[in-house]
């Protein structure tokens, strides 16, 4: 699994990629199975999770295959490992944010 | 250039359903979604949902889930709108609008003027 | 969902004044995904800003937008007589896509 390092307060962009070059249906979660983000045509869709607001996507990657989760404003407890689904492939991201 | 022409006002009895549709010229019909937005008299916009014409994709908002389906015919550039169960309530403007993706951005940046939908007993 | 409130419902000013127009959400959103739509009677939505600041096109410079988070507000520099009209705030971070409800800007 892929470790990425993320200093508090800072903006992390953790990538997922799909072999079809295309925009298709791609959601993210994290390790408790929680819905944070995905879509739904041109459009984003946000789940419960806590980062809510703080997460966001880039959609003008998506007709590429790229699917990133970019969550702003790091928080310590946003280590996690994330899990990105698309095309019934499971990517698995770890995070880990650290203070000064 | 480019224009959304919609079919002409409707009225409609409690219960029954109704069908509008948008037809699309002067640009390339499936580069676009198609976004449906309603508006009652005197009151602001709400949007309804979206077709993709390339795909056919669709999405609505929970408020109209089961109720409303949005289709298109791509032979004839024209994207459709069909509400069913209708009460007093849905007596709106429905307007369709195509929807940009650019970039990161999304918008919608050209409007038809309108169907004129009224529920009446 | 996130709510899209508008203040004033009305305003009232003259030509050549400066009208501000504020659109709040409900939740903080990227300036990416906050557009403003003008609206005359018996008339469709134009589309004036996407994106937060950046203008349609066609869409006079007077037409300004600005904000993040939760704060959004759009600006005509100098009122002309054909920008009395409604104008609604509408965003699309996630779905459902939503307005909010709308400023009217009246002649005083």
């Known amino acids: 699994k892929k470790v990425v390092l993320g200093k508090k307060g800072d903006t992390v962009e953790l990538t997922c990629t799909a072999s079809q070059k295309k925009s298709i249906q791609f959601h993210w979660k994290n390790s408790n199975q929680i819905k944070i983000l995905g879509n739904q045509g041109s459009f984003l869709t946000k789940g419960p999770s806590k980062l809510n607001d703080r997460a966001d996507s880039r959609r003008s990657l998506w007709d590429q295959g790229n699917f990133p989760l970019i969550i702003k404003n790091l928080k310590i407890e946003d280590s996690d490992t994330y899990i990105c689904e698309v095309e019934d492939q499971k990517e698995e991201v770890q995070l880990l944010v650290f203070g000064l | 250039q480019v224009q959304l022409v919609h079919s002409g006002a409707e009225v409609k009895k409690p219960g029954a359903s109704v069908k509008v549709s948008c037809k699309a010229s002067?640009?390339?019909?499936?580069?676009?979604?198609i976004n449906w937005v309603r508006q009652a008299t005197g009151q602001g916009l709400e949007w309804m949902g979206w077709v993709n014409p390339n795909s056919g994709n669709t999405g609505s908002t929970q408020k109209f889930q089961g109720r409303v389906t949005m289709t298109r015919n791509t032979s004839i550039s024209t994207a459709y709108m069909e509400l069913s169960s209708l009460r007093s309530e849905d007596t709106a403007v429905y307007y369709c609008a195509r929807g940009v993706l650019k970039g990161d951005y999304y918008y919608m940046d050209v409007w038809g003027k309108g169907t004129t939908v009224t529920v009446s007993s | 969902e996130i709510v899209m409130t508008q203040s004033p419902a009305t305003l009232s000013l003259s030509p050549g004044e400066r009208a501000t127009l504020s659109c709040r959400a409900s939740q903080s959103i990227s300036s990416t995904y906050l557009s403003w739509y003008q609206q005359k009677p018996g008339q469709a939505p134009r589309l004036l800003i996407y994106?937060?600041?950046t203008r349609a096109t066609g869409i006079p410079a007077r037409f300004s937008g600005s904000g993040s988070g939760t704060d959004f507000t759009l600006t005509i520099s100098s009122l002309q007589p054909e920008d009395f009209a409604v104008y609604y705030c509408q965003q699309d971070d996630h779905l459902p896509l939503t307005f909010g409800g709308g400023t009217k800007v009246e002649i005083k």
């Open positions: 994106g937060s600041s």
């Open positions: 002067g640009y390339t019909f499936t580069s676009y979604d």
